[in-house]
C-alpha cells in the first residue's frame, strides 16, 4: 500500500535538484577564487540538513544557519544591486558592471536561483510532486525561508549607497509584500546606509512619465526616510540603452538622459 | 580515489550482460553524476549514459534508448545493464564521475566487452 | 542530439612545435566543453572544462579558447609525451537534461 503523501499547491522540487545544486556549487567556485576554499559536498550536505525529514511548513531561518555559515562571503557592501519583480535586468547589468552585485551573484543566491525544493516530515526523501505554496500553503516553506533568510543578511551587509531596481511596468512599483519589500528595506542598517537609490525601469519605449513620483515609490521614500536613510530615484526611460551605456560608457550617446 | 569496471568478457550476440563501476575512496551517497562511456577497437569515445546519485534521475544517448539501462545499486557501484547484444557493441566500456559542472576527472581503466559467435 | 564536430583527424608537428585542434558544436553550448587526451591502454585524462579552464596538474602548455560552437585547443612547446589522442567533449547540465557528445578525436603525433 503506498504511504499518503501530503499534496502542496506549489510545484515539486526540481528536477535533479541535488546534482544542481553541486553542479553550481562547483561552477560558481571555479569562477570565484575567493570561494575556492568551499566544500561542495558540505555545502550539499547543509543545504539539504535544512530542509530535509522536516515538516515543509515548518521551517525556520535557523534550520539554514550551518548553510549560512558554510556559504559566508564578503562582497563590496557599497557594491549592492537590490531588485524587486525584474531580475532579468538586474543580473545583465551585474553581469557587465562587474563590480556589482545583486543577490544571486553570492554564493547562495547562485545555488538557488529559480530551483524548488521540499521534503517531508520523518522521511530522508525529497518531494518532487508538489511543494507548498507561499499564499495558499503556508509561508514557512523551505523556499520561502531560504529567500528570506539570505535577503536579510544581503541586505543588513550593505552600506553606504544602496541601489534598487524596481519594475515600472508593474501596478506597484514599490510593493510591500515583496522580498525587497517585507525583508530588504526593513534590514538596511541607518548606521552604514547613507541613500537608497531606486532605479525604476520604464516597459513602454514612448513612456516618458516621470514614475518617481508614483504612489508606491513616495511610500518607499516615507519607509526609508522614518528609518534616517536618505532616498534617492531615477527614471531608467531606455533600459536597453541603459545597458548598452554601461558596456561603452564613452559612447556620444551616452550623455543624454536614459 | 577510484573506480574499476567489472563485467566485461566474451557475450553471444542477443544475449545481455551488466557491467559494475564500484567506487572507492569515496562514496556515491554523496552527489556526483556517474556515466559510461563506450570505445570501440580504433575507434573514439561514444557516450553510453549517466546517473545522478542523489536524484536517481538518468539520461540516455539516443541510440543507447531501451537497449541499456543505467542504476545506482549501492553506496558504492553504478551498474550498466545491457541487451540484445550485437558485435557493434564490442568495445572496451569505462565510467568516470562527475562531481558536478561537467568535469569528467575521475574514469576507471575500462572492460572489455566482446560480441561474438 | 549535439554533433561535435573535430578538426583535423591527425596532425603531426615537430617536438618545440605547436598543434592546434579545432571542434565545432551542431549547436550553441556556451563554454561547456572539455578537453581529454588519452594514450592507447589508457582512459581518457581531463585536461581542460568550461572551454578554457586548466585541470588540476595539466601543464599550461596546453590552452583552450572559444565559446558558442567554435572551440580550440592549442598545444605550445610539443613535448614527445603529449603524443595522443584528443577529444573534445559537450556537455549541457540543466536540471532536465545531462547530454553529451565526443568528438571524432584528433591524433597527434610527435616527431
Known amino acids: 500500500v503506498p504511504r499518503w503523501r501530503q499534496q502542496w499547491s506549489g510545484p515539486g522540487t526540481t528536477k535533479r535538484f541535488p546534482e544542481t545544486v553541486l553542479a553550481r556549487c562547483v561552477k560558481y567556485t571555479e569562477i570565484h577564487p575567493e570561494m575556492r576554499h568551499v566544500d561542495c559536498q558540505s555545502v550539499w550536505d547543509a543545504f539539504k540538513g535544512a530542509f530535509i525529514s522536516k515538516h515543509p511548513c515548518n521551517i525556520t531561518e535557523e534550520d539554514y544557519q550551518p548553510l549560512m555559515k558554510l556559504g559566508t562571503q564578503t562582497v563590496p557592501c557599497n557594491k549592492i544591486l537590490l531588485w524587486s519583480r525584474i531580475k532579468d535586468l538586474a543580473h545583465q547589468f551585474t553581469q557587465v558592471q562587474r563590480d556589482m552585485f545583486t543577490l544571486e551573484d553570492t554564493l547562495l543566491g547562485y545555488l538557488a536561483d529559480d530551483l524548488t525544493w521540499c521534503g517531508e516530515f520523518n522521511t530522508s526523501k525529497i518531494n518532487y510532486q508538489s511543494c507548498p505554496d507561499w499564499r495558499k500553503d503556508c509561508s514557512n516553506n523551505p523556499v520561502s525561508v531560504f529567500w528570506k533568510t539570505v535577503s536579510r543578511r544581503f541586505a543588513e551587509a550593505a552600506c553606504d549607497v544602496v541601489h534598487v531596481m524596481l519594475n515600472g511596468s508593474r501596478s506597484k512599483i514599490f510593493d510591500k509584500n515583496s522580498t525587497f519589500g517585507s525583508v530588504e528595506v526593513h534590514n538596511l542598517q541607518p548606521e552604514k546606509v547613507q541613500t537608497l537609490e531606486a532605479w525604476v525601469i520604464h516597459g513602454g519605449r514612448e513612456d516618458s512619465r516621470d514614475l518617481c513620483q508614483d504612489p508606491t515609490i513616495k511610500e518607499l521614500e516615507s519607509i526609508i526616510s522614518k528609518r534616517n536613510i536618505q532616498f534617492s530615484c531615477k527614471n531608467i526611460y531606455r533600459p536597453d540603452k541603459f545597458l548598452q551605456c554601461v558596456k561603452n560608457p564613452e559612447d556620444s550617446s551616452c550623455t543624454s538622459e536614459i | 580515489q577510484e573506480l574499476v569496471e567489472s563485467g566485461g568478457g566474451l557475450f553471444q550476440p542477443g544475449g545481455s550482460l551488466a557491467l559494475t563501476c564500484k567506487a572507492s575512496g569515496f562514496s556515491l551517497s554523496n552527489i556526483y553524476v556517474m556515466c559510461w562511456v563506450r570505445q570501440a577497437p580504433g575507434k573514439g569515445l561514444e557516450w553510453i549514459a549517466c546517473i545522478g546519485t542523489g536524484s536517481g534521475d538518468t539520461d540516455y544517448a539516443t541510440w543507447a534508448k531501451g537497449r541499456f539501462t543505467i542504476s545506482k545499486t549501492s553506496s558504492t557501484t553504478v551498474t550498466l545493464q545491457m541487451t540484445s547484444l550485437t558485435a557493434a557493441d564490442t568495445a572496451t566500456y569505462f565510467c568516470?564521475?562527475?562531481?558536478?559542472?561537467?568535469?569528467?576527472?575521475?574514469w576507471g581503466p575500462g572492460t572489455l566487452v566482446t560480441v561474438s559467435s | 542530439d549535439i554533433v561535435m564536430t573535430q578538426t583535423p583527424s591527425s596532425v603531426e608537428a615537430a617536438v618545440g612545435g605547436t598543434v592546434t585542434i579545432k571542434c565545432q558544436a551542431s549547436q550553441t553550448i556556451g563554454s561547456r566543453l572539455a578537453w581529454y587526451q588519452q594514450k592507447p591502454g589508457q582512459p581518457p585524462k581531463l585536461l581542460i572544462y568550461?572551454?578554457?579552464t586548466l585541470a588540476s596538474g595539466v601543464s599550461s602548455r596546453f590552452k583552450g579558447s572559444g565559446s558558442g560552437t567554435q572551440f580550440t585547443l592549442t598545444i605550445s612547446d610539443l613535448d614527445s609525451a603529449d603524443a595522443a589522442t584528443y577529444y573534445c567533449?559537450?556537455?549541457?547540465?540543466?536540471?532536465?537534461?545531462?547530454?553529451?557528445?565526443f568528438g571524432g578525436g584528433t591524433e597527434v603525433v610527435v616527431k
Open positions: 568550461s572551454a578554457s
Open positions: 568516470a564521475r562527475d562531481p558536478g559542472a561537467g568535469t569528467w576527472n575521475l
Open positions: 567533449q559537450s556537455y549541457y547540465y540543466t536540471s532536465t537534461s545531462y547530454p553529451n557528445a
